[in-house]
């Protein structure tokens, strides 16, 4: 059976991707060099391990998390890896150019790779809203635009609010969620009869999605502490994330059962909700003074995600006209906001406890940063969505949504596939 992928795209995609890669290699040749400073071998290993954790989260965690479609699991995992690989390269260059003025040579360190991986992860989160509805050429465009938009957001925030360019990555959950939702909103909406089959989850893909959730669950403390310098803050971030995740697992499984008329557990809800705590404490994990607070946040996040898993897809479909966005993705948008609000509340409490007169200023600053993140996410998401709708990309027909056969060569086409 021949591929339904338009021939023009099949011909030009490899060429375009390789040309883009060649261009990146040239940019690396002219504008980058390795960090020449000396680092103790033990320190190097410790620093590398954090980056390794982030890569596992991005490649395995987010890769498998989105593989919960019966006919789209290959594409989910492989396209995710493709986006990650491309995103990291572009993010390293962009971060290097944007974080120094006047622009000079970009120094590549383990830390810059860590930052780039986090920037690329935002694309993977956003892609959760569009995977299955777009082809690889469109995803390439999405990677380049979103990494650039996130870099621009951080640049704008650092110039307006005088905060460190890299520190602004803390908004990446919210940015990624709203960017993805906006892009999905722009894509062709109706799902014709007969393709619901592709949209159904099957046991094996749901298990692989759960595997992805487990990878994310194990390494989430790393992503929440990856950018912090202070050992105490890093430790707080790790512990608080761990406790919040632990509680959200218990909440997810029991809440999923409660939400079902026959008290049965839904795997779809579970693999989304188990991660709720990690997202909810993401922005404020270094500020949380004791475990119980993190646990409460994990509980609230778990409940929100179970409620969201039931209501949000329906809401997105009917109100926004966005058909199928991954449950995890819709939850990111809610929990990202919960995390940001928690951060602002904790900021107020800290400044009150410490008798700091800067309270109003601090809160305004945080609200300003959050608002800017959402505005830029929506704007750049809208532009990307409109760009992806152009005919030149030869987007998959709506009848071919969530179908691996459009993109992949199968050794044998078993009837049950």
């Amino acid at each position: 059976m021949s591929s339904k992928y338009p021939r023009s795209v099949r011909r030009c995609l490899p060429l375009c991707a390789l040309t883009l890669e060649a261009a990146l290699i040239l940019l690396f040749y002219f504008f980058t060099h390795y960090d020449a400073s000396l680092e103790d071998q033990k320190g190097l290993v410790a620093s590398y391990q954090v980056g390794q954790d982030l890569t596992v989260m991005a490649a395995l965690g987010l890769g498998f998390l989105t593989s919960n479609f019966r006919r789209h699991s290959w594409s989910s995992v492989a396209f995710n890896l493709f986006m990650l690989a491309l995103g990291v390269q572009w993010a390293i260059l962009l971060d290097g150019f944007l974080s120094q003025f006047p622009p000079g040579k970009v120094v590549i360190t383990l830390f810059s790779i860590r930052l780039a991986t986090m920037s690329a992860m935002s694309v993977l989160i956003s892609a959760g809203a569009v995977l299955g509805k777009v082809n690889l050429a469109q995803l390439v465009v999405m990677v380049l635009v979103e990494v650039t938009a996130l870099g621009t957001l951080r640049m704008v925030i650092s110039n307006i609010f005088n905060t460190d360019y890299h520190m602004n990555l803390r908004h990446f959950y919210v940015f990624a969620a709203y960017f993805g939702l906006t892009v999905a909103w722009c894509l062709p909406k109706p799902l014709p009869k007969g393709t619901e089959d592709n949209d159904q989850r099957a046991t094996i893909p749901s298990l692989s999605a759960m595997l992805g959730a487990l990878f994310l669950w194990m390494f989430w403390p790393s992503v929440n502490s990856a950018l912090l310098r202070s050992p105490i803050q890093r430790k707080n971030a790790m512990f608080n994330t761990y406790y919040a995740l632990a509680v959200s697992v218990v909440t997810a499984i029991s809440g999923s059962s409660l939400a079902h008329p026959q008290r049965k557990i839904s795997m779809t809800y579970v693999h989304s909700a188990v991660l709720a705590g990690g997202v909810a404490v993401g922005t404020s994990c270094h500020l949380i003074p004791s475990p119980w607070l993190a646990m409460v946040l994990g509980l609230v996040a778990g409940l929100i995600s179970i409620g969201g898993a039931k209501c949000l897809p329906v809401c997105c479909n009917r109100v926004l006209g966005i058909h199928h966005i991954s449950v995890m993705h819709s939850i990111f948008s809610l929990l990202g906001l919960l995390g940001e609000i928690t951060y602002i509340v904790l900021l107020v409490l800290h400044t009150v406890w410490n008798g700091n007169g800067m309270i109003g200023f601090q809160v305004l600053l945080s609200i300003g940063e959050l608002s800017l993140a959402i505005v830029i996410a929506l704007t750049s998401g809208l532009l990307t969505g409109l760009l992806l709708n152009l005919k030149i990309w030869k987007a998959p027909h709506v009848a071919k949504y969530f179908d691996d056969q459009v993109f992949w060569k199968f050794p044998h086409l078993a009837v049950g596939f």
Epitope: D164, H166, M167, L227, R229, S230, Q233, R234, L347, T351
Partner: antibody, heavy 128, light 107 residues
């Protein structure tokens, strides 16, 4: 309250290796970043390098051209500075200091904060 | 490597006066700057971190502002014990460079 005390030989000969230690009390070294700074007679302050008390991550001043090594011993709650191939230009008061941290102003893994606690300093003279 | 400059290199003022010391970075360091006070024969003492945040235990007559490349330390209502050398330090990228210092004398 945290207290830092530098110790080591006050006198060294050119081309020798200088080894200083900094004993810390009142705080666990694994909770902070620690720096070594020196001040030549009548001159300003020069940052030598730093170590993360919770990992083995270190950063050094490139002007010292790889002659410096900072290490820690968590069991003794102390830090060490090793400077090889010393010359008369290394004559200075050597300080160890702790980096402060404010949860409201979290700093990035590559940026620091102010040094909020300092030792009294150790006078080191290098001469033949 | 980042360069830090301070001005003036020395100044003299009377008790009760308001003095301002400037510090300039050769490139953008956001708010990653600290100010120290050093008295003769003593170790430096942290006054300000994060460009404008007052270290606990430091009198409120010390204040600071600035971001990017231009920073200032202001001492209002000068006291005799404020006679010292004041240093700024960038803590944006290592090596964390100190400024050359400003010597403040009380008349």
């Amino acid at each position: 309250e945290v207290q830092l005390l530098e110790s080591g030989p006050g006198l060294g000969k050119p081309s020798e290796t200088l080894s200083l230690t900094c004993g810390v009390s009142g705080a666990s070294i694994s909770n902070y970043w620690w720096s070594w700074i020196r001040q030549s007679p009548g001159k300003g302050l020069e940052w030598i390098g730093e170590i993360d008390g919770s990992t083995y991550s270190t950063h050094y001043n490139p002007s010292l051209k790889g002659r410096v090594t900072i290490s820690k011993d968590a069991s003794k709650n102390q830090l060490s500075l090793r400077l090889t191939s010393v010359t008369a230009a290394d004559t200075a008061v050597y300080y160890c200091a702790r980096e402060g941290q404010d949860p409201l102003a979290p700093t990035l893994a590559t940026s620091g904060s102010g040094l909020d606690s300092w030792g009294r300093g150790l006078v080191v003279t290098v001469s033949s | 490597e980042l360069q830090m400059t301070q001005s003036p290199s020395a100044l003299s003022a009377s008790v009760g006066d308001r003095v301002t010391i400037s510090c300039r970075a050769s490139q953008d360091i956001y708010s990653n700057l600290a100010w120290y006070q050093q008295k003769p024969g003593k170790a430096p003492k942290l006054l300000i971190y994060g460009a404008s945040r007052l270290q606990s235990g430091i009198p409120s007559r010390f204040s600071a502002s600035g971001a990017g490349t231009e920073f200032t330390l202001t001492i209002s209502g000068l006291q005799p014990e404020d006679s010292a050398v004041y240093y700024c330090q960038e803590v944006h990228r290592n090596p964390f460079t100190f400024g050359p210092g400003t010597k403040l004398d009380i008349k």
